[in-house]
């Protein structure tokens, strides 16, 4: 039980895409504020989003320090005008989040086709290597830098004039596919991490078609 009129947070949920990671919870506060703490299993608690009336807290800066660690967060509830006040057990009311391992659980963002180039009967399709907020040596790493060969892309492609699709895979960010000369093709890609059991696939990228500006044609 907590202090009068203070309720514990509930429905603590991690929302994470390409390592941009936000903890969300309920309820919208009435005469109370929240503070969030985050820790690795073996680490110390670090406080974030002090005395906020928001019901979300961006924890990206903490989780990108080591995306392979497992994190736990907790949300403390305090009376709005009296943040020193504690629960009957002598400490503020709080609720724990589920555990979260960014490397295994962050959603894969919708990929983007960067370019495609036709040379004769071959087309090279390049997927944009999206920058993440994960840092190494003061530079931001791309999705490929972080996941390496764990990340593959699936390409769907089809003649503009027909509905029959084909598919190809790559563990780089480039596809080289055979096409029929004189035909226009459309492309869409999807990111996949085969070794995962959840959040394995992204949504499909926007469709890009030959004859539009992203492409280049050479005999």
């Amino acid at each position: 039980s907590g202090t009068t009129n203070t309720v514990a947070a509930y429905n603590l949920t991690w929302k994470s895409t390409n390592f941009k990671t936000i903890l969300e919870w309920e309820p919208k506060p009435v005469n109370q504020v929240y503070t969030v703490q985050i820790s690795t299993k073996s680490g110390d608690w670090k406080s974030k989003c002090f005395y906020t009336t928001d019901t979300e807290c961006d924890l990206t800066d903490e989780i990108v320090k080591d995306v392979k660690q497992t994190y736990l967060a907790r949300v403390f509830s305090y009376p709005a005008g009296n943040v020193e006040s504690t629960g009957s057990a002598g400490e503020p009311l709080y609720e724990n989040s589920p555990e979260f391992t960014p490397y295994l659980e962050t959603n894969l963002g919708q990929p983007t086709i960067q370019s495609f180039e036709q040379v004769g009967t071959k087309v090279n399709v390049t997927v944009e290597d999206e920058r993440t907020l994960v840092r190494r040596n003061n530079t931001f790493l791309s999705l490929r830098d972080v996941f390496g060969k764990d990340l593959i892309y699936t390409l769907y492609y089809w003649k503009s004039s027909s509905s029959g699709k084909k598919t190809a895979k790559t563990n780089t960010n480039e596809f080289l596919i055979d096409v029929d000369k004189g035909e226009n093709y459309c492309f869409s890609v999807q990111a996949v991490i085969p070794s995962r059991t959840v959040n394995r696939k992204s949504t499909d990228s926007p469709v890009e078609c030959m004859g539009q500006e992203k492409g280049e044609f050479r005999e």
């Epitope: 699709k165 596919i177 059991t197 696939k201």
Partner: antibody, heavy 117, light 107 residues
């Protein structure tokens, strides 16, 4: 425990149709690609096609493109194969399989389709 | 379509023998090559993926090698339960295509 159970096989008249079901349990089909394979008696495996149940993309072997339709009902966690204009050479055991994108880690037990008058 | 040529189509071997099966692709498949084992009346079972990675629960006597167009499955010491048909499968692009299969029989 992951399980794939095919059903809907049996005797079909030449020129007829079949609709096979692949009921999945122990995982969410939306997280994977689901494929259909077949194997004629005493022959090798033959790929029919696949579906990404979440996005709805389907890909077929060109030889089945005009006769096969793969679909999925995510609420039932089930994939389907519809094949039309059946002929004697379509007699086979039909398997569904889960594809991780690296390999097929689970197959169903198979369902036998016999096309005969 | 990518053609997969598997050899031999059958072989006879004894328990304890070292067995090698090869698969050649009609063009570079960039190690998108899996090996499957199938026993009569049963569904296939994955042994090797990405040409060289041993699937979970598969005994270490099975190994895969190769790159580009040429790939090999090796069984270092054949066991009684290994008598079966083996298939290579390319999954780098559609349509997925398989070798014709290699039946490993008891000598």
């Amino acid at each position: 425990e992951v399980q794939l159970v095919e059903s809907g096989g049996g005797l079909v008249q030449p020129g007829g149709s079949l609709r096979l079901s692949c009921a999945a349990s122990g995982f969410n089909i939306k997280e994977y690609y689901m494929h259909w394979w077949r194997q004629a008696p005493g022959k090798g495996l033959e790929w029919v096609g696949l579906i990404d149940p979440e996005q709805g993309n389907t890909i077929y072997d060109p030889k089945f493109q005009d006769r096969a339709t793969i679909s999925a009902d995510n609420s039932k966690n089930t994939a389907y194969l519809q094949m039309n204009s059946l002929r004697a050479e379509d007699t086979a055991v039909y398997y569904c399989a889960r594809d991780t994108a690296a390999y097929f880690d689970y197959f169903g037990q198979g369902t036998l389709v016999t096309v005969s008058s | 379509d990518i053609q997969m040529t598997q050899s031999p189509s059958s072989l006879s071997a004894s328990v304890g023998d070292r067995v090698t099966i090869t698969c050649r692709a009609s063009r570079d498949i960039k190690s998108y090559l899996n090996w499957y084992q199938q026993k009569p009346g049963k569904a296939p079972k994955v042994l090797i993926y990405y040409a060289t990675s041993l699937a979970e629960g598969v005994p270490s006597r099975f190994s895969g090698s190769g790159s580009g167009t040429d790939y090999t499955l090796t069984i270092s010491s054949l066991q009684p339960e290994d008598f079966a048909t083996y298939y290579c499968l390319q999954h780098g692009e559609s349509p997925w295509t398989l070798g014709q299969g290699t039946k490993v029989e008891i000598k």
